[in-house]
Amino acid sequence: LQDLCSNCPAGTFCDNNRSQICSPCPPNSFSSAGGQRTCDICRQCKGVFKTRKECSSTSNAECDCISGYHCLGAECSMCEQDCKQGQELTKKGCKDCCFGTFNDQKRGICRPWTNCSLDGKSVLVNGTKERDVVCGPSPADLSPGASSATPPAPAREPGHSPQ
């Protein structure tokens, strides 16, 4: 009898109620391998999920996140809200990075500007909420009388926005 079940192809299941005949998977279910005794329920892409690939009798549906969200986890099992560059996501929504910190992604958290002086360098371009500082030559490398046009960036300490 086991041999009968092993003959059931993907897209079917071995129906014990019908003398182990191979029956097609019911609507909204699938079996991706042969010899299955049940079909699996199709994944539904709803809420913050949208359908990338419809379910078929032999393969599960695949989901993406709707616009304004990004995928996390295997097979996009989770969706997390996007923010703008220069922000981070908190429970109260997207918040601007604190002064001295930046985020160049639509996801993730703000992190401190690089402290150029720790490497003996000076600040060539100021940091913003969206971009890290750009470090230039060390002050000693500058021509006589020249000095850094901007003050050194704050030390790399974590920001303090509420999460």
């Epitope: 996390l72 429970k91 993730g108 690089t114 509420p162």
Partner: antibody, heavy 116, light 109 residues
Framework: QVQLVQSGAEVKKPGESLKISCKGS????????ISWVRQMPGKGLEWMGK????????NYSPSFQGQVTISADKSISTAYLQWSSLKASDTAMYYC?????????WGQGTLVTVSS | DIELTQPPSVSVAPGQTARISCSGD??????AHWYQQKPGQAPVVVIY???NRPSGIPERFSGSNSGNTATLTISGTQAEDEADYYC???????????FGGGTKLTVLG
């Protein structure tokens, strides 16, 4: 598909140094935080610290500050956890995980045993 | 540092509802996440951002979070739910993540 693959189990003596690794694949390694999590035998999960591989910015749990060093080499999509002088109390399973709050992918863990 | 406190163990009969609490000062101001860990395996997210369930996690898992307590609820608990459960949160103050001490869920019978 996204994977975090950790280096193999280590057996060390007290006072020795050690560096374990976590190699990411299947995603933009530089732009996602990597956290390290300790689990001592029969105990719970403890967050140790994290690194942003894009610029190697790190921050540590106060409990682990100065005890370990977290680093990364984005050119080979690998994060590291290292000790300069191991203690018997460092015996534990160490996991790397992607993320800073929601840890959506985990390595298989590296078992570190420190015994004289 | 925020500290998260969980009961060390919770027991439940099959088919009954299990509730696992996670207490911490004003944890409701931050997102709480829940992880399930079975012996010899890495943890898996079962609830994220207080109440969201990843796809592939059964509908019997749910979460809530307000005030000083986050709660993981498993309705109609099954034998396969026996595992260790950890709450976790991330706080922007110091940019730290923290796990609760963990709760061993035993499904009786």
């Amino acid at each position: 598909q996204v994977q975090l693959v950790q280096s193999g189990a280590e057996v060390k003596k007290p006072g020795e140094s050690l560096k374990i690794s976590c190699k990411g694949s299947g995603y933009s390694f530089s732009t996602y935080w990597i956290s390290w999590v300790r689990q001592m035998p029969g105990k719970g999960l403890e967050w140790m610290g994290k690194i942003y591989p894009g610029d190697s910015y790190t921050n540590y749990s106060p409990s682990f500050q100065g005890q370990v060093t977290i680093s990364a080499d984005k050119s080979i999509s690998t994060a590291y956890l290292q000790w300069s002088s191991l203690k018997a109390s460092d015996t534990a399973m160490y996991y790397c995980a992607r993320g800073y709050g929601i840890f959506d992918y985990w390595g298989q863990g590296t078992l570190v045993t420190v015994s004289s | 540092d925020i500290e998260l406190t969980q009961p060390p163990s919770v027991s439940v009969a099959p088919g009954q509802t299990a509730r696992i609490s996670c207490s911490g000062d004003n944890i409701g101001d931050q997102y709480a996440h829940w992880y399930q860990q079975k012996p010899g395996q890495a943890p898996v997210v079962v609830i994220y951002q207080d109440k969201n369930r990843p796809s592939g996690i059964p509908e019997r898992f749910s979460g809530s979070n307000s005030g000083n307590t986050a709660t993981l609820t498993i309705s109609g608990t099954q034998a396969e739910d026996e595992a260790d459960y950890y709450c976790a949160t991330y706080t922007g103050f110091g940019s730290l993540a923290v796990f609760g001490g963990g709760t061993k869920l035993t499904v009786l019978g």
